[in-house]
């Protein structure tokens, strides 16, 4: 015969633990129900009655199954120079992120401590890894046959156009110049852009020093000053 399903509250078997979404109440010495995300424990369980849950009030939340007496307060409103990427709801805290073109270089419990500008790759270098909300752009030198003629945190290296007759060969920072009226194959005009950073929860990410025009944020690393990376044009 199948074992009888116990309904909360119930006394656990000696040596066993409570089931998923239940907790052991020390006072009642019973397994009791947790409250779902967006709720909190209004009345704790007894030997004869289960936990009574209630919804979180405005500007408060619980993200996990819980038995807390009060919901957590949402963080303060995002300042005018931050972007709210996640609103405060009963089930999640507000998340404020850095303005476009900046990323969180140092984080703290309540969000970001220091926003820093995303590195810009100078001509001859393209974006190898785009920036995110919590990590800087990584630049790389343009490989032979490719170029970037912009100072940008989003442009990648693009192939040189192929000419019937080359007037000026391309290099890492300049496209090839053709003598004929049109090249045999050319890329679509305009720079290639990588997508802007997607929102992620703030966390500390050590940036990788790379060629750039934006200041290197290697100041976050626990070491003394080092020479700028090759191709860097920062002050």
């Amino acid at each position: 015969l199948p074992a009888q399903v116990a309904f909360t509250p119930y006394a656990p078997e000696p040596g066993s633990t409570c089931r998923l979404r239940e907790y052991y109440d020390q006072t009642a010495q019973m397994c009791c129900s947790k409250c779902s995300p967006g709720q909190h424990a209004k009345v704790f369980c007894t030997k004869t009655s289960d936990t009574v849950c209630d919804s979180c009030e405005d500007s408060t939340y619980t993200q996990l199954w819980n038995w807390v007496p009060e919901c957590l307060s949402c963080g303060s409103r995002c300042s005018s120079d931050q972007v709210e990427t996640q609103a405060c709801t009963r089930e999640q805290n507000r998340i404020c992120t850095c303005r476009p073109g900046w990323y969180c270089a140092l984080s703290k419990q309540e969000g970001c401590r220091l926003c820093a500008p995303l590195r810009k790759c100078r001509p001859g270098f393209g974006v190898a890894r785009p920036g995110t909300e919590t990590s800087d752009v990584v630049c790389k030198p343009c490989a032979p046959g490719t170029f970037s003629n912009t100072t940008s945190s989003t442009d990648i290296c693009r192939p040189h156009q192929i000419c019937n007759v080359v007037a000026i060969p391309g290099n890492a920072s300049m496209d090839a110049v053709c003598t004929s009226t049109s090249p045999t194959r050319s890329m679509a005009p305009g720079a290639v852009h990588l997508p802007q950073p997607v929102s992620t929860r703030s966390q500390h990410t050590q940036p990788t020093p790379e060629p750039s025009t934006a200041p290197s944020t290697s100041f976050l690393l626990p070491m003394g000053p080092s020479p700028p990376a090759e191709g860097s044009t920062g002050d």
């Epitope: 300042s79 120079d81 931050q82 850095c98 073109g101 969180c104 140092l106 703290k108 419990q109 309540e110 969000g111 970001c112 401590r113 220091l114 926003c115 820093a116 500008p117 025009t213 934006a214 200041p215 100041f219 920062g234 002050d235």
Partner: antibody, heavy 119, light 107 residues
């Protein structure tokens, strides 16, 4: 309201050290970095460094490494700056300052402490 | 380090006049510029951030403008209480740096 109250003026001899204090009130002390800024008589402002009270993380302007040491006492909501091997160049008003957000402009300034180095 | 240059150490003006204080950064600072007012014997006070956003409680006669490397603080109608030194600051990269200050004097 948010306030940063700094210690009184200091007259010190060349080669000596001095410890300046900055007592915070009206906000959660451990949640915001405290910065220190130097102002020499008739001159501009120079950023010395920051300290994050929650974990003691510090960052110094290269120019002040070895000259200034920043510390905090979270039990008294006080930030400190130790200045070492003082010379006449260190005679200045020193301000502590706080920022609200993750961009580093300073919206709350301390009252300032005048340090005079003289024999 | 980014150098912030305030070309005028002093500016003499009359009550009611318009005055513009300039600040030039040694590199593009993406409007990460703040302006402070420091009256004699007092601590600096934040006026403007992000080049043009007025801080809470700052009178609307103070306006900031600029982008790239060139920034301006304008007082549209100078009042006697505006006698002070004004500093620009960049918060684009560490170390944070300030201009040398421009002292506004009332004729």
């Amino acid at each position: 309201q948010v306030q940063l109250l700094q210690s009184g003026p200091e007259l010190v001899k060349p080669g000596a050290s001095v410890k300046l204090s900055c007592k915070a009130s009206g906000y959660s002390f451990t949640s915001y970095d405290i910065n220190w800024v130097k102002q020499r008589p008739g001159q501009g402002l120079e950023w010395v460094g920051w300290i994050y009270p929650r974990d003691g993380d510090t960052k110094y302007n290269e120019k002040f490494k070895g000259k200034a040491i920043l510390t905090v006492d979270t039990s008294s909501n006080t930030a400190y700056m130790n200045l070492h091997s003082l010379t006449s160049e260190d005679s200045a008003v020193y301000f502590c300052a706080r920022l609200t957000g993750p961009y580093w402009y300073f919206d709350v300034w301390g009252t300032g402490t005048t340090v005079t180095v003289s024999s | 380090d980014i150098v912030m240059t305030q070309s005028h150490k002093f500016m003499s003006t009359s009550v009611g006049d318009r005055v513009s204080i300039t600040c030039k950064a040694s590199q593009d600072v993406d409007t990460a510029v703040a302006w402070y007012q420091q009256k004699p014997g007092q601590s600096p006070k934040l006026l403007i951030y992000w080049a043009s956003t007025r801080h809470t409680g700052v009178p609307d006669r103070f306006t900031g403008s600029g982008s790239g490397t060139d920034y301006t603080l304008t007082i549209s109608s100078v009042q006697a209480e505006d006698l002070a030194r004004y500093y620009c600051q960049q918060y684009y990269s560490v170390p944070w740096t300030f201009g040398q200050g421009t002292k506004v004097e009332i004729k």
